[in-house]
């Protein structure tokens, strides 16, 4: 139901009076205040913004808003002694070099302290050899070149196109792989949208254009240097030989101007099919090498890029609850951005200020939330999610008995098409809800509601009338609340049409073309679906913090579970014959996801029964609904992920942006047929599936009657 | 074949005006910028303007701004620069030229006309 | 604006000859540096974009090489057609700017 209930109010001060009070132009504003110059992590211009918001959050009338800070590590060009990768010929000459820098965007020419492209947290190196062209470099592309092609990665340096996966995962193949070096492209073929113009004339990536971004394999650590704890000023820090998820290659990247120049002249085997071909005017050739006449040639990587440790800022604004002052619920998104940050991170940003600025005018006219909300503007998001963890790191102990939610604000758009949302199943009838109430910006929906738009546009493959909701993955701030705390998390936002746009994220992500007029001229001119984002993020941080029972619907949990079980099973029994010969039953998983649907149909039962005007009643069924996400927490985590804790929900194994359902089962039967000891894989897998059904038998337990 | 045909040069008196044009063929007119470089007698080229028929954005030297006015007719495939108050300095063959993109440098060249600013 | 230093002025060379003109920009321009020849009466003809890339038709004994600011247009061996004006021209920010051009002359 809605929430009309907070306290010391007059009626008026509801959802609605909420919702209206977010402005469409109070988001542009924002968005053009903070993608004026760059917001790069660790520089002077974020410790600015960072004590911007800090001001502006108090004026809009937050209880108290603070700066927490951390010296992490961070990865930074050599101003002197830039990255880039050439060609040589036989004497060593350098006959073809990339690009040093993009060039400006209009009006951005005399801007300073443009970060150039880099892949940070490389490490140093000149490596020279033959190139390699190892597709996404996606494990399935490692498996068609070793296994199928025959071809040895060793001592190459490979080139990969960006996008499918997080560009970390391509980079720890290629290292498993044996590659010295690696050079990330982005190909037209996944980052320009056929019959749209390049950046300035259209929203499509130039050919001098680059996707920086971070190489880390952190696995939910934070700061390298300091995993499980905060890095504050008694911490005690690793040598960089121990820290977490550094890579051990040199890594750059290039656009694809640059990349035909090194794809042309590609010999060595064909590609495999055509899954392989991008759109550039080269033949794809694997290699490895140079073709004929230039076989002599060489490839030669110049990297010089350092690691620091690095004073970081978070903002962390409170607005206390009235009633329950001890449950939070937490709205936060990051503020660093590589260069201007047009969309990433500053149309979430943007979005968050705007959902303080009416929080805080409602707060103003003498309301208060029923339970506590944080605001937050992390730090070092785009660095390996550092600044978020590290304070979860250091509050654990408060989220893990307080955190009812976490709700992410990072880029409000990717594109203009529907909506997309991300989160527990916890929130799956909150999202449907509450999108059954807002108006739909879309053209051709005019008066008709988001959820119908949505629902045409993004239908879920499972369930008709009923949009498309996916897992949470990883590559963003939630990680650490909802994959090493185990607090409920959603996240929304504006996308494109994934049918006929196939290309990976947008085409400008990460590059400097990344401005403000890129989102005003070309994404969202009046600012509707920054609005749209702006209602359904604060809408569910309203309706998180306001209502009296939590919108959280654990039959909806129940749901995904049975469907995640069939999915799992179905997988192992891809291999029967084992099977049969090492006894794998899923009998006992199958046997917790019935009783969980059991005990959660009559939880829910209770739940619309019980004496709400009874304050200790109320607080313990919450309790219940609170703590279920947190009941899927393994405190050993999964094997060799400590910090992913989730049994049910995972980042892939094989890219840190996707979600895996019952990770530890799926990566033990990952390829199992092809390990060396069939006994001990497939034993694995059986402890596994013990694992898993003991978590969800135990979490079907928190919601049973207490006595 | 790319062809760009310059024409409407001449003598002008000092102060007046002229429109040259640029009339393009063998392309895709939309697809490309065009560009205006001047080259006064015995003198090195000097980049004035660039339009974008795409979205009819302007970009001018310092030297012609508020002076020069780019524009074209999309219905013709032809650029025009139109130059007012001109001065001796503004004599020079003009060149119409294109570039596949904001950041690319220009592939075909008109073969130039010439302007004469004289009393 | 971004200056760009064209040297020599005047190069006087024989056929056969390896001829090398230098362009230094004011400040750095990545790669984004063109080269183009000019003959009398006639209008620029680009020979390489992007510092390195050679323009489809032109004879490979033109070279370029360079990033940053100091950027060298090679002619590996000197023929006749050769003799001609070049000028360097940067194309990574408005305004366009060019050196201020070359004369390859008959030794």
């Known amino acids: 139901k809605s929430s009309n209930e907070a306290t010391n109010i007059t009626p008026k001060h509801n959802m609605k009076a909420f919702l209206d009070e977010l402005k469409a132009e109070n988001i542009k504003k924002f968005l053009y205040n903070f993608t004026q110059i760059p917001h790069l992590a660790g520089t002077e211009q974020n410790f600015q913004l960072a004590k911007q918001i800090q001001s502006q959050w108090k004026e809009f009338g937050l209880d108290s808003v603070e700066l927490a800070h951390y010296d992490v590590l961070l990865s930074y060009p050599n101003k002197t002694h830039p990255n880039y990768i050439s060609i040589i010929n036989e004497d060593g000459n350098e006959i073809f070099n990339t690009s040093l820098f993009e060039p400006p965007p209009p009006g951005y020419e005399n801007v300073s302290d443009i970060v150039p492209p880099f892949s940070a947290f490389s490490p140093q190196g000149m490596p020279e050899g033959d190139l390699v062209y190892v597709n996404y470099a996606r494990t399935e592309d490692f498996f068609k070149l070793e296994r199928d092609m025959k071809i040895n990665c060793s001592g190459k340096i490979v080139i990969a196109r960006y996008g499918k996966v997080f560009r970390g995962n391509k980079v720890k193949n290629a290292q498993l792989a044996g590659a010295k070096g690696v050079i990330l492209y982005s190909d037209p073929a996944d980052y320009f949208a056929p019959g749209v113009k390049s950046y300035p004339d259209g929203w499509n990536l130039p050919g001098g254009g680059v996707q920086r971004g971070n190489i880390l394999n952190l696995n939910g650590a934070g700061d390298p240097l300091t995993p499980g704890y905060p890095a504050n000023e008694y911490a005690y820090r690793r040598g960089i030989a121990e820290a977490v998820g550094l890579p051990s290659i040199p890594v750059h990247p290039i656009g694809y101007y640059d990349a035909q120049k090194l794809l042309e002249k590609m010999g060595g085997s064909a590609p495999p099919d055509s899954s392989w071909r991008g759109s550039l005017k080269v033949p794809y050739n694997v290699g490895p090498g140079f073709t004929g006449n230039f076989s002599t040639q060489k490839v030669k990587m110049h990297i010089h890029s350092t690691n620091e440790v690095t004073r970081i800022y978070n903002v962390i604004g409170t607005l206390r609850g009235a009633v329950e002052p001890d449950r939070y619920v937490i709205l936060g998104g990051h503020r660093d951005s590589w260069v201007f940050g047009g969309i990433d991170p500053q149309s979430g940003a943007a979005v968050v200020h705007e959902i303080v600025r009416s929080f805080g005018t409602l707060k103003k006219e003498g309301w208060r939330p029923r339970r506590t909300i944080l605001f937050a503007s992390w730090d070092a998001e785009e660095f390996g999610l550092l600044g978020s963890t590290e304070w979860a790191e250091e509050n654990s102990r408060l989220l893990q008995e307080r955190g009812v939610a976490y709700i992410n604000a990072d880029s409000s758009i990717e594109g203009n098409y529907t909506l997309r949302v991300d989160c527990t199943p916890l929130m799956y009838s909150l999202v449907h809800n509450l999108t059954k109430e807002l108006k739909s910006p879309d053209e051709g929906f005019e008066g008709k509601s988001l959820y119908e738009s949505w629902t045409k546009k993004s239908p879920s493959p499972e369930f008709s009338g009923m949009p498309r909701i996916s897992k949470l993955g990883s590559g963003n701030d939630f990680e650490v609340f909802f994959q090493r705390l185990g607090i409920a998390s959603g996240r929304a936002r504006y996308t494109k049409n994934w049918e006929t746009n196939k290309f990976s994220g947008y085409p400008l992500y990460h590059s400097v073309y990344e401005t403000y007029e890129l989102v005003e001229k070309f994404y969202d001119p009046m600012f509707k679906y920054h609005l749209t984002v702006a209602q359904v993020r604060g809408g569910m941080v309203f309706e998180l913090a306001n209502s009296i029972v939590l919108p959280f619907d654990c039959r909806d949990y129940a749901v995904v579970l049975r469907k995640y079980a069939d999915k799992i099973y179905s997988i192992s029994m891809k291999h029967p014959q084992e099977m049969k010969t090492y006894s794998v039953s899923f009998d006992s998983l199958f046997s917790a996801v019935k009783n969980f649907t059991e005990i959660a149909s009559k939880f829910s039962e209770r739940l619309q029964d019980f004496d709400k005007s009874n304050p200790i009643v109320l607080r313990m069924m919450n309790d219940q609904l609170m703590f279920l996400e947190r009941a899927f927490i393994d405190p050993l985590g999964l094997p060799d992920r400590p910090f992913y804790r989730h049994v049910i929900y995972a980042p892939s194994s094989h890219n840190k942006y996707a979600g895996e359902s019952f990770p530890g089962i799926y990566d033990a039967l990952f390829d199992i047929e092809s390990k060396v000891d069939p006994s001990k894989a497939w034993g694995e897998v059986k402890r596994q599936i013990y694992v898993a059904a003991f978590t969800v038998q135990a979490a079907a337990e928190t919601l049973s009657e207490v006595a | 074949e790319v062809q760009l045909l310059e024409s409407g040069g001449g003598l002008v008196q000092p102060g007046g005006s002229l429109r040259l044009s640029c009339a393009a063929s063998?392309?895709?007119?939309?697809?490309?910028?065009i560009h205006w470089v001047r080259q006064a007698p015995g003198k090195g080229l000097e980049w004035i303007g660039s339009?974008?028929?795409?979205?009819?954005?302007?970009s001018y030297a310092d030297s012609v701004k508020g002076r020069a006015t780019l524009s074209v007719d999309k219905s013709k495939n032809t650029a025009y620069l139109q130059m007012n108050s001109l001065r001796a300095e503004d004599t020079a063959v003009y060149y119409c030229?294109?570039?596949?993109?904001?950041?690319?440098?220009?592939?075909?060249w008109g073969q130039g006309t010439l302007v004469t600013v004289s009393s | 604006d971004v200056q760009i230093t064209q040297s020599p002025s005047t190069l006087s060379a024989s056929v056969g000859d390896r001829v090398t003109i230098t362009c230094r920009a004011s400040?750095?321009?990545?790669?984004?540096l063109a080269w183009y020849q000019q003959k009398p009466g006639k209008a620029p003809k680009l020979l390489i974009h992007?510092?390195?890339s050679l323009e489809s038709g032109v004879p490979s004994r033109f070279s370029g090489s360079g990033s940053g600011t100091e950027f060298t247009l090679t002619i590996s061996s000197l023929q006749p057609d050769d003799f001609a004006t070049y000028y360097c021209?940067?194309?990574?920010?408005?305004?366009?700017?060019f050196g201020q051009g070359t004369k390859v002359e008959i030794k």
């Open positions: 030229a294109r570039s596949d993109g904001y950041y690319d440098a220009m592939d075909y």
């Open positions: 063998g392309y895709t007119f939309t697809d490309y910028y």
């Open positions: 339009f974008n028929p795409y979205n009819d954005y302007t």
């Open positions: 400040k750095s321009i990545s790669k984004y």
């Open positions: 992007s510092g390195s």
């Open positions: 021209q940067q194309h990574i920010e408005y305004p366009w700017t």
